[in-house]
């Protein structure tokens, strides 16, 4: 396993419907075919997976049906979105990249971005 | 059809290590989390640990240090490991199937539980 | 962690009865499970998100429930509902299981 560099932004705040975008850029040794990108969540001490794709160079990226993340990819750059945030998802977001293929494996993980969720605020009651 | 089934020792010494092998048909290991939870004798359940389809672990903070968890995709079995088992890791072990990931739009379910297969902890 | 609170421990119920069982929890939960256990035998989900039907289970289960308060209600009690009921939170972790509601048939 050999070490790789990822870059992602320190802080991101997600819109008033709960979606966050970040960038997830990598310094790729080599020419990988294939590469899996996982976003993880650090709150409370506890790390948990969000969502994860494994994509070819080239092709667009796959999550699983009901994941709340979707993405593309460009070059080593892979471009992320979260949604269905709410304030209690408020976290730090790690984004890891394993460059599948070919050999060898290398793995980066990068320093995590902020994500600040605030819940929108109930619109008050109209006479309209 | 979607199945679970658990192998284990049946009997641990104390201080000894347990490992169970969960081995599952009907889905892929990449597309869903397989969830560990055991059951002491007459009590309720305790969730031990979950291994995610990306292959990232998360354990019970009581248990973590003791704890471990990993899979294979390729022969669609996943493995907990356990360290210094006490009488009170004396319990049914259930390997369950359930979300792919901790945050998703929907679908927040352990919907296939394996048979369990029963360790007791004793000299 | 966040502790769920099953009540009662222990629920007679006759055939035909209309059964309300509750979980309240520590701190607000998001998404609710429900499991039936019989003895002997493995957990069987009966509710997942809080309030949709697991499949193959019968329409008499529903769950209900926002915050820190959820109950599974079972419409007509049948003899072979009688097991143990089990909540479980998603929105936090560690998960976390209730004690469990004994139904028993009275």
């Known amino acids: 396993c050999k070490a790789m560099h990822v870059a992602q932004p320190a802080v991101v705040l997600a819109s008033s419907r709960g979606i966050a975008s970040f960038v997830c850029e990598y310094a790729s040794p080599g020419k990988a075919t294939e590469v899996r990108v996982t976003v993880l969540r650090q709150a409370d001490s506890q790390v948990t997976e969000v969502c994860a794709a494994t994509y070819m160079m080239g092709n667009e990226l796959t999550f699983l049906d009901d994941s709340i993340c979707t993405g593309t990819s460009s070059g080593n750059q892979v471009n992320l979105t979260i949604q269905g945030l709410r304030a209690m998802d408020t976290g730090l977001y790690i984004c890891k990249v394993e460059l599948m293929y070919p050999p060898p494996y290398y793995l980066g993980i990068g320093n995590g971005t902020q994500i600040y969720v605030i819940d929108p605020e109930p619109c008050p009651d109209s006479d309209f | 059809q979607v199945q679970l089934k658990e192998s284990g020792p049946g009997l641990v010494a104390p201080s000894q290590s347990l490992s169970i092998t969960c081995t599952v048909s009907?889905?892929?290991?990449?597309?869903?989390?397989v969830y560990w939870v055991r059951q002491p004798p007459g009590k309720g359940l305790e969730w031990l640990g979950v291994?995610?389809?990306?292959?990232?672990?998360n354990y019970n903070s009581a248990l973590m240090s003791r704890l471990s968890i990993s899979k294979d995709n390729s022969k669609s079995q996943v493995f907990l490991k356990m360290s210094s088992l006490q009488t009170d890791d004396t319990a049914m072990y259930y390997c369950?199937?359930?979300?792919?990931?901790?945050?998703?739009?929907?679908?927040?379910?352990?919907?296939?539980w394996g048979q369990g297969t029963s360790v007791i902890v004793s000299s | 962690q966040n502790v769920l609170t099953q009540s009662p421990a222990i629920m007679p119920a006759s055939p035909g009865e209309k059964v309300t069982m509750t979980c309240s929890a520590t701190?607000?939960?998001?998404?609710m499970s429900w499991y039936q256990q019989k003895s002997g035998s493995s957990p069987r989900l009966l509710i997942y998100?809080?309030?949709n039907l697991a499949s193959g289970v019968p329409v008499r289960f529903s769950g209900s429930g926002s915050g820190t308060s959820y109950s599974l209600t079972i419409s007509r009690m049948e003899a072979e509902d009688a097991a143990t009921y089990y909540c479980q939170q998603w929105s936090s972790y560690p998960l976390t299981f209730g004690a469990g509601t004994k139904l028993e048939l009275k």
């Open positions: 291994i995610w389809a990306g292959g990232t672990t």
């Open positions: 701190s607000s939960i998001t998404y």
């Open positions: 998100d809080t309030s």
């Open positions: 369950a199937r359930g979300p792919p990931h901790a945050m998703m739009k929907r679908g927040y379910a352990m919907d296939y």
């Open positions: 009907g889905f892929s290991l990449t597309s869903y989390g």
